[in-house]
């Protein structure tokens, strides 16, 4: 604009970003996740960054351990506030087994269905949070390929807490959780030293999820 308020040059606006994502968070709820409120704090920080609604981002949560529970479906809540309240009420289901393949497969087959609120043509995102090698890792390769075939973008988070508490090697575990993440792995895989450190990755995780919207 010139000093006399005449248009001298115009720039086309940046293409408007779609704010539509269907996000399913797959939480390991086995006993070794401790303390559980570190998980709910992580959820709180992540979810409050989201513009949640039927025409915007939708969030569903699945918890797994020895078996799988749909905590809430993608279309259950229509605002960020409602989702935050629900996420804070999620209790740890417990169990000794970590059936990660089962958790991911259930999310793919059930949580991402239209019956549970998934929208046709909307990008699907799965966030997997776990702290141990899966007891069903023989199924993991196929389960991940099935997600890939359905264009589900996967972010995986490895919590090293139980390994560090027991002075155990994390190498095999980290490799497994990396294999869950979409390519490029360095943009889709996170690891944290313990449960308390989950909140430290929220900003970056949020940015990377919403980079998918562009």
């Amino acid at each position: 604009v010139s000093p006399t308020f005449q248009v001298v040059n115009s720039i086309a606006p940046v293409q408007e970003c779609s704010t539509q994502l269907d996000i399913v968070i797959v939480l390991d709820g086995s006993n070794s996740i401790y303390p559980w409120d570190s998980v709910t704090a992580f959820l709180n920080d992540l979810l409050e960054r989201m513009d949640i609604g039927p025409k915007q981002t939708q969030v569903g949560i699945v918890q797994y351990g020895e078996n799988v529970t749909h905590e809430f479906n993608l279309n259950k809540y229509s605002s960020t506030e409602e989702v935050l309240v629900a996420a804070n009420k999620i209790v740890q289901r417990g169990g000794r087994q970590t059936m990660t393949a089962l958790g991911i497969d259930t999310a793919r087959k059930e949580a991402f269905t239209e019956a549970r609120g998934a929208r046709r043509g909307v990008k699907k995102v799965m966030v997997i949070v776990t702290d141990g090698e899966s007891h069903d890792n023989h199924r993991l390769k196929k389960v991940i390929q099935d997600c890939e075939d359905e264009n589900i973008q996967r972010f995986s988070i490895a919590i090293l807490g139980s390994y560090n508490r027991g002075n155990l090697s994390t190498e095999k575990f980290v490799e497994e959780i990396k294999s869950i993440a979409s390519e490029p792995t360095e943009k889709h895989f996170f690891n944290v030293s313990d449960e308390l450190a989950l909140v430290t990755i929220v900003k970056t995780l949020g940015e990377r999820i919403f980079a998918l919207e562009a």
Partner: antibody, heavy 124, light 108 residues
Framework: EVQLVQSGAEVKKPGESLRISCKGS????????IGWVRQMPGKGLEWMGI????????RYSPSFQGQVTISADKSISTAYLQWSSLKASDTAMYYC??????????????????WGQGTLVTVS | EIVLTQSPGTLSLSPGERATLSCRAS???????LAWYQQKPAQAPRLLIY???RRATGIPDRFSGSGSGTDFTLTISRLEPEDFAVYYC?????????FGQGTTVEIK
């Protein structure tokens, strides 16, 4: 609502056997460890041992190893503490408590978030 | 085995006053895995604080925990009549659980 309900008070003679119980409800009982804690008259709290009802994996405090037996019956969501031969020094209040945490891979950690009402055992 | 020593043994205070209870460990408590419990006469212990500073569900905010390593503190900012009880600290970072001997908070 999470609840741990313990069996009633017991009066026994030295040398007798005894089994007390702790029944869980309001949560997946087979998925959480249950601990036992002793409180002798006018004294503090002592951890005795812990069991995972799902598979009956059990750990004992060195002080109580061989003195008591901890068991569980997952079909009825119940954990047990038993003695084969009671002594007068076993007179105490015994509490069961749910562990929020884990005891796998040789490492135990966590706090006891729900407690039973206690079972008073008197041996005289 | 980590030994926990609580002080003072007895604290005599009036309602409305601030209570400061100490728990000292014989060696460092890993990851600040320390809890505080309240026990009233003829009742089971009740969880107040875990991981040194996190309040359990339903615990009023007048209760707060702090500390790390070997020194931990439970503070009750303003004593209510129902707060007069015995308080135990407990560590759980060593594959076993040990309790302190307790601090009695009594009405002055």
């Amino acid at each position: 609502e999470v609840q741990l309900v313990q069996s009633g008070a017991e009066v026994k003679k030295p040398g007798e056997s005894l089994r007390i119980s702790c029944k869980g409800s309001g949560y997946s009982v087979t998925s959480y460890w249950i601990g036992w804690v002793r409180q002798m008259p006018g004294k503090g709290l002592e951890w005795m041992g812990i069991i995972y009802p799902g598979d009956s994996d059990t750990r004992y405090s060195p002080s109580f190893q061989g003195q008591v037996t901890i068991s569980a019956d997952k079909s009825i969501s119940t954990a047990y503490l038993q003695w084969s031969s009671l002594k007068a020094s076993d007179t105490a209040m015994y509490y069961c408590a749910r562990l929020q945490g884990d005891c796998s891979g040789g490492t135990c950690y966590g706090h006891f978030d729900y407690w039973g009402q206690g079972t008073l055992v008197t041996v005289s | 085995e980590i030994v926990l020593t609580q002080s003072p043994g007895t604290l005599s205070l009036s309602p409305g006053e601030r209570a400061t209870l100490s728990c000292r460990a014989s060696q460092s408590v890993s990851s600040s895995y320390l809890a505080w419990y309240q026990q009233k006469p003829a009742q089971a212990p009740r969880l107040l604080i875990y991981v040194a500073s996190r309040r359990a569900t339903g615990i009023p905010d007048r209760f707060s925990g702090s500390g790390s390593g070997t020194d931990f503190t439970l503070t009750i900012s303003r004593l209510e009549p129902e707060d007069f009880a015995v308080y135990y600290c407990q560590q759980y970072g060593t594959s076993s659980w040990t309790f302190g001997q307790g601090t009695t908070v009594e009405i002055k």
